[in-house]
């Protein structure tokens, strides 16, 4: 095979481009699933973000989250999803493993479980792109 | 090493439909995107869509929308490209391409198929 | 979607020249772009990944630059066995559109 070491295929503008991305379309999908009313947060649902063991950007759980927002594709219909998961898979290893997610089959539960993962995951972007920067930072000083 | 092969050439009248297949072998990745393209005679190359088949998950081009259907057998590693509504223009040779690289998006086609012409005529 | 204008769409050049082919993507695209070469009834074939970095058995006067949203192909030293036609491709978000080509001839 002729791939390069991983370290040498990816800028680091690269990776904080493809997570400024995901930021900004995190709160797209949030504007979105927010226009819905009378629905509430759930304790229930806890969307895995950043391991504490690795290093930017593989201390994203980027598999993990990739498997919640498709689970939100299956149980609504929000085109901004293809896109997230397009950005998503330029940080997932081709061999990482699979995540299941057991669906909400009520529909009051569906929606509640839509609106905790989609502000669990803008919140998760604001936190990955300061790990970034201040990765970058510490890099540079 | 990947190989990609192709179903044979197709003639097919106007109004039809076309199934072209591409068949997988040599890689062990589950997580990738695989595309098809096409070139019309003496045209350039034209994106069509894409397949991450682990999940039957699928991208269109807008031109295509409606009328392009990309499926795939896990368990064949083969994919398949289903053109429906066919006409003169479609007269093109159609390409599967496959990605390496560590991560599940591609940044380049490494492996191409060999082509598979299809001629709509009446 | 995102526009690659390749240009020019054609060019002749002589033995031994460097030849340059550009694409211009219409918004930022990082690094996510592949160039190709095709030559007459021939599958394409992966010159270029990421921008630059050289697929297995390019030969070395190959090589890929990136300039904010400008890409660019460089043949150090056109050989008679570069006739051919070259496509740029960006793989940022789909669709993964494509230049519109550019056809190397031997003066």
């Known amino acids: 095979s002729h791939t390069l070491p991983v370290r040498l295929l990816r800028p680091s503008d690269d990776v904080q481009k493809i997570v400024e991305e995901l930021q900004s379309l995190s709160k797209m999908l949030l504007k979105d699933v927010e226009e819905e009313k009378g629905v509430l947060v759930s304790q229930n649902y806890t969307l895995p973000c950043l391991s504490p063991d690795a290093q930017p950007p593989n201390n994203i759980h980027s598999p993990a989250i990739r498997a919640y927002l498709k689970t939100i594709r299956q149980l609504d219909n929000k085109s901004v999803i293809d896109e997230i998961i397009e950005h998503l898979d330029k940080l997932i290893f081709q061999d990482a493993p699979e995540t299941n997610i057991s669906v909400p089959t009520d529909t009051h539960e569906s929606k509640r479980f839509i609106l905790t993962i989609s502000q669990q995951f803008s919140e998760c972007m604001d936190l990955a792109l300061k790990s970034l920067t201040s990765g970058a930072q510490q890099a540079t000083t | 090493q990947v190989q990609l092969v192709q179903s044979g050439a197709e003639v097919k009248k106007p109004g039809s439909s076309v199934k072209v297949s591409c068949k997988a072998s040599g890689y062990t990745r589950t997580r990738y995107w695989m595309q098809w393209v096409r070139q019309a005679p003496g045209q350039g190359l034209e994106w069509m869509g894409a397949?991450?088949?682990?999940?039957?998950?699928?991208r269109y081009s807008q031109k295509f929308k409606g009328r392009v259907t990309i499926t795939a057998d896990k368990s064949t590693s083969t994919a398949y490209m289903e053109l429906s509504s066919l006409r003169s223009e479609d007269t093109a040779v159609y390409y599967c391409?496959?990605?390496?690289?560590?991560?599940?998006?591609?940044?380049?086609?490494?492996?191409w198929g060999q082509g598979t012409t299809v001629t709509v005529s009446s | 979607a995102i526009q690659m204008t390749q240009s020019p769409s054609s060019l002749s050049a002589s033995v031994g020249d460097r030849v340059t082919i550009t694409c211009r993507a219409s918004?930022?695209?990082?690094?996510?772009l592949a160039w190709y070469q095709q030559k007459p009834g021939k599958v394409p074939k992966l010159l270029i990944y990421y921008a630059k970095t050289s697929a297995s058995g390019v030969p070395s006067r190959f090589s890929g630059s990136r300039s904010g949203t400008d890409y660019t192909l460089t043949i150090s030293s056109l050989q008679p066995e570069d006739v051919a036609t070259y496509y740029c491709q960006h793989f940022w978000s789909t669709p993964w559109t494509f230049g519109g080509g550019t056809k190397v001839e031997i003066k």
């Open positions: 397949i991450y088949p682990a999940e039957g998950d699928t």
């Open positions: 391409a496959f990605p390496e690289g560590p991560y599940a998006a591609p940044y380049g086609m490494h492996y």
């Open positions: 918004r930022n695209i990082g690094n996510y």
